[in-house]
């Protein structure tokens, strides 16, 4: 059994860290492997993570943190029965993906305004909370060529758009992701989308 | 130092109830694990008891023989008790809380499975 | 899950070379682990993952196996190590940790 792509791990800067590794061949990982990890700390325990399939030779682990804070350290051994096939380690603050953004509502009650708004997914003691800015995509569910990214930069999870900007009596879809600037993290997964309808209408057409 | 510190045992009439506490301190705050008790009857082996995620999530775990008179539960992530009702002359044991390691399949499964830091230990002898 | 330990007690010189074994009911993997324990004192782990060896604890003992058959060796018996001695066995699949009856290694 060899390991063909190492395992490489992403943070949520929370409570949970996510390794990726492929195999050498098809594997039942949660049947033939385990990932060991264990905080570089006194006393910390080694805890077992078992893995599940992530396509036919690939393999994912969740492992599972209290907190995490920016000296943290974790060694990681993967096992194969009684077989050490890597060993590794891995530091959360330096390779952070944040939570995906939630609650993404579209409200178009006022006439001449799209507004959008979805949660911060830290909670307000988490050092990322003050941190997250958004990209905001918007598209024409008829016409994917009818796409935009609105960069919100300000820490309020909201964005108004004019409802002018968009084509009337279509249906859009809307969707948000995240991340951190000064934890140089990467782009969080999207949001799950959300759709509206666009029922504006320019005055001089309702004439 | 890293300790666990047990508290709150003593003599207790049969059929009565006693809570146990353990405080935890010396640890890192970002390490999760679980909290657990185990006990030993005087010359007698070791018995888990139970455990409770430290963690946001608190998830418990107990034997078989524990389930409905013990419970266990968590103040915050350093300090756990262990509930004892209609005690009975063979609950009279040292209790011990000790720190475990767990196995964990995805982010909500996740099993306790040894101990590695323990307590002194509390005497709880239930007498009339 | 049952956990069956051997032999209870023991008797052995300083020096000595030391096994005892742990018999699991059912298969558990690796989930293994041994404790020492002095008498007024609270376990002290030795072994975990059937092989690890705990922090600070001698590199006389030693552990192996994996799934039903466990062995936890003493390779050369110290004065210290007169105590009794527990594996802990855990399935998470019937969701249970389990102790062994414990073997009391004492003085010849």
């Known amino acids: 059994m060899k390991v063909l792509q190492e395992p490489t791990c992403v943070s949520d800067y929370m409570s949970i860290s996510t390794c990726e590794w492929k195999m050498g061949g098809p594997t039942n990982c949660s049947a033939e492997l385990r990932l060991l990890y264990q905080l570089v700390f006194q006393s910390s325990e080694t805890h077992t993570c078992v893995p599940e399939n992530n396509g036919g030779v690939g393999c994912v682990c969740h492992l599972l943190m209290d907190d995490v804070v920016s000296m943290d350290n974790y060694t990681l051994d993967l096992w194969a029965g009684q077989q050490l096939l890597w060993k590794g380690s891995f530091k959360p603050s330096e390779h952070v993906k944040p939570r995906a953004p939630g609650n993404l509502t579209v409200h178009t009650n006022v006439s001449d305004t799209v507004l959008l708004t979805w949660s911060n997914p830290y909670p307000p003691d988490n050092y990322l909370y003050n941190d997250l800015t958004y990209a905001v995509n918007i598209w024409n569910e008829n016409d994917l060529a009818d796409s935009r990214i609105h960069n919100v930069t300000y820490l309020k999870p909201t964005l108004r758009i004019p409802a002018s900007t968009l084509k009337s009596g279509i249906s859009y879809r809307a969707r948000v992701r995240a991340w951190a600037q000064h934890y140089n993290t990467t782009w969080s997964e999207w949001s799950p989308s959300t759709k509206w309808y666009n029922s504006y209408r320019e005055p001089f057409e309702q004439r | 130092e890293v300790q666990l510190v047990e508290s709150g045992g003593g003599r207790v009439q049969p059929g009565g109830s006693l809570r146990l506490s353990c405080a935890a301190s010396?640890?890192?705050?970002?390490?999760?694990?679980?909290m657990c008790w185990v006990r030993q009857a005087p010359g007698k082996g070791l018995e888990w008891i139970g455990c409770i995620y430290a963690g946001s999530r608190g998830s418990t775990y107990y034997a078989s023989w524990a389930k409905g008179r013990f419970t266990i539960s968590k103040a915050s992530s350093t300090t756990v008790y262990l509930q004892m009702n209609s005690l009975r002359a063979e609950d009279t044991a040292t209790y011990y809380c000790a720190r475990a390691a767990f196995v964990n399949r995805g982010v909500s499964w996740i099993w306790p499975y040894y101990f590695s830091l323990w307590g002194q230990g509390t005497q709880v002898t239930v007498s009339s | 899950i049952q956990m069956t330990q051997s032999p209870s007690s023991l008797s052995a010189s300083v020096g000595d070379r030391v096994t005892i074994t742990c018999q699991a009911s059912e298969d558990i993997e690796s989930y293994l682990a041994w404790y020492q324990q002095k008498p007024g004192k609270a376990p002290k782990l030795l072994i975990y993952?059937?092989?690890t060896l705990a922090y600070g604890v001698p590199s006389r003992f030693s552990g192996s196996g994996s799934g039903t058959d466990f062995t936890l060796t003493i390779s050369s018996l110290q004065p210290e190590d007169f105590a009794t001695y527990y594996c802990?066995?855990?399935?998470?699949?019937?969701?249970?940790?389990?102790f062994g009856t414990g073997t009391k290694v004492t003085v010849l």
């Open positions: 993952r059937a092989s």
């Open positions: 010396g640890f890192s705050s970002s390490s999760a694990h679980y």
């Open positions: 802990l066995g855990s399935s998470y699949s019937t969701g249970s940790n389990i």
